[in-house]
């Protein structure tokens, strides 16, 4: 069994034209599709082509693209037609450049690392700034110093501990060679120096079936940006949700199967059953995506007796977004932004 079923033939032969001087048409109506959908390589999205006709494997970075053969939206790709002037018919799939950041009036590029001052090293990550402290987390001299105090010393960037003795004369503290220090206090001091940052979850890597979503967070003991992942399933691939849309309606925002079910992953089964909600479909040219969701922890039991747990996207509500594909759509980024309740999860 292939992980995900892939593309219809994409040889970019335009359909016959009445007017040969005009831009080529890559869509034919009525739709002509092969009897069974293609099967995609691992990690390649099976999507509906740009003609809204047939299933195809999404074009990847560096591939040619047309209005029919569209770039993989789950990999942040768009069709760059700039090399095909003046026709703008055949483009190349390119990466959407991440959003830059502005901090204290200074603009930084996506991915750029910088030091806003001598105390922090920061990185711009898709519009948000994550920082890690450069000043060493020196422990306060509790054992022999009754009144430790951190002070700025001229010529030094980082504050240092001084000890206020009975004569109220500050003296610089010496390092102690003792293990009798409360480690919790050190972690708390560390986190006071750490600007906590968690990016929004990325969109699910597949439009149907099991996918993955990632985010970057420095909420850890090292305050170091790490990638977290969670499983996601926006909608089942084997259910034609279009048939469930009531007459006269343009959307079915949420689809929920009647029976509860167990999640399966790599031959392992969830230890309890769930009744998940899925995003539905929109009849017009919009995509149905989660806007109220959270992350739950699902435990799996495997046939060999081993078990593991995974973070999984839990959908509460969905809505029809304006556009799934247009890279110039300023609202398209909403797809990757969860509601506030999710950030706490």
């Amino acid at each position: 069994t292939a992980l995900s079923p892939a593309p219809t033939t994409m040889d970019f032969t335009p359909a016959p034209l009445e007017d040969t001087s005009s831009r080529p048409q890559f869509c034919k109506w009525p739709c002509e599709c092969p009897p069974s959908p293609p099967r995609c390589p691992l990690g390649v999205s099976l999507i509906t082509d740009g003609c809204e006709c047939c299933k195809m494997c999404a074009q990847q970075l560096g591939d040619n693209c047309t209005e029919a053969a569209i770039c993989d939206p789950h990999r942040g790709l768009y069709c760059d037609y700039s090399g095909d002037r003046p026709r703008y018919a055949i483009g190349v799939c390119a990466q959407v450049v991440g959003v830059g950041c502005v901090l204290d009036g200074v603009r930084y590029n996506n991915g750029q690392s910088f030091q806003p001052n001598c105390k922090y090293n920061c990185t711009c990550i898709d519009g948000a700034v994550g920082c890690t402290p450069l000043c060493l987390r020196v422990r306060p001299p509790r054992l022999w110093c009754p009144h430790p105090r951190r002070v700025s010393i001229p010529g030094h960037c980082c504050e240092q501990w001084v000890c206020e003795d009975d004569a109220k004369r500050p003296r610089k503290t010496a390092p102690r060679d003792t293990g009798a220090f409360d480690a919790v206090g050190e972690v708390e001091a560390w986190h006071r120096n750490c600007i906590a940052y968690t990016s929004p979850w990325s969109p699910c890597s597949t439009s149907c079936g099991l996918g993955v979503s990632t985010r970057i967070s420095n909420v850890n003991a090292q305050c170091w940006p790490e990638q977290e992942s969670r499983l996601c399933n926006l909608r089942p691939c084997d259910v034609d949700i279009h048939t469930l849309i009531k007459a006269g309606k343009k959307c079915l925002a949420v689809y929920q199967p009647e029976a509860s079910m167990n999640f399966t992953l790599a031959g392992c089964i969830s230890t309890r059953s769930y009744q998940p909600k899925y995003c539905g479909v929109c009849m017009d040219n919009r995509c149905c995506i989660p806007y109220k969701s959270k992350t739950i922890d699902v435990s799996f039991q495997c046939p060999d007796g081993l078990g593991f747990s995974r973070q999984v996207l839990w959908i509460n509500a969905c809505f029809c977004n304006l556009s799934c594909r247009n890279p110039n759509d300023i609202f398209a980024d909403l797809e990757s932004y969860p509601d506030f309740s999710e950030i706490a999860n």
Partner: antibody, heavy 119, light 110 residues
Framework: QMQLVQSGAEVKEPGSSVKVSCKAS??????LNWVRQAPGQGLEWMGG????????NYAQKFEGRVTITADESTNTAYMEISSLRFEDTAMYYC??????????????WGQGTLVTVSS | QAVLTQPPSVSKGLRQTATLTCTGD????????AAWLQQHPGLPPKVLSY???SRPSGISERLFVSRSGNSASLTITGLQPEDEADYYC???????????FGGGTQLTVL
């Protein structure tokens, strides 16, 4: 630099099983594929897995007799063949796709693991 | 039995040009193109070109790849002794849902 490090050579008896590992440096969201090459023969794709997903993809010929698994935390893929036959004697390669080009999974190759089936 | 068809061997003289061919059908080469691999004896294969005919960095500019319909070709100009190796084409087959290879072409530089 991307690296794929495979486990060492194995000598097995017919009917037994063998499990070969492939540890990849870097991102665990790229497919790791298994390709075998019998002595003096061509390349044959067996299947693949994305460690972060954990769901394998098999060539029809190997379905049922080959099990591909992965450990997401160590970014390691495993390929196990059961009911070994003499004709399974081959060099087994692990190959990872390159950045962005999803239809070219063969940018990075492990050094290969020689599996010999002998009685 | 290899899904993609390649000539078993090609022999050319030093500094000459060799063209290797790979024929498939509309569900593999004709669909998404082919990638080319080079393999020297006792070593793992090495990718020479992507299926969109571009070359990875560090691969000689003496190599040219092209595709027409269901066939792909690899042309090596100014043949050198180090070009003597086995060459394989590979493609994703969207009907089989599998990576497929050619049987390989042994290139001999005389």
């Amino acid at each position: 630099q991307m690296q794929l490090v495979q486990s060492g050579a194995e000598v097995k008896e017919p009917g037994s099983s063998v499990k070969v590992s492939c540890k990849a440096s870097g991102d665990n969201s790229y497919p790791l594929n298994w390709v075998r090459q019998a002595p003096g023969q061509g390349l044959e794709w067996m299947g693949g897995i994305i460690p972060i997903f954990g769901t394998p993809n098999y060539a029809q010929k190997f379905e049922g007799r080959v099990t591909i698994t992965a450990d997401e935390s160590t970014n390691t893929a495993y390929m196990e063949i059961s009911s070994l036959r003499f004709e399974d004697t081959a060099m087994y390669y692990c190959a990872r796709e390159g950045d962005g080009y999803n239809y070219s999974p063969l940018d990075y190759w492990g050094q290969g693991t020689l599996v010999t089936v002998s009685s | 039995q290899a899904v993609l068809t390649q000539p078993p061997s090609v022999s050319k003289g030093l500094r000459q040009t060799a063209t290797l061919t790979c024929t498939g059908d509309s569900s593999n080469v004709g669909n998404q193109g082919a990638a080319w691999l080079q393999q020297h004896p006792g070593l793992p294969p090495k990718v020479l070109s992507y299926r969109n005919n571009s070359r990875p960095s560090g691969i000689s500019e003496r190599l040219f790849v092209s595709r027409s319909g269901n066939s792909a070709s690899l042309t090596i100009t100014g043949l050198q002794p180090e070009d003597e190796a086995d060459y394989y084409c590979s493609a994703w087959d969207s009907s089989l849902g599998a990576w497929v290879f050619g049987g390989g072409t042994q290139l001999t530089v005389l």
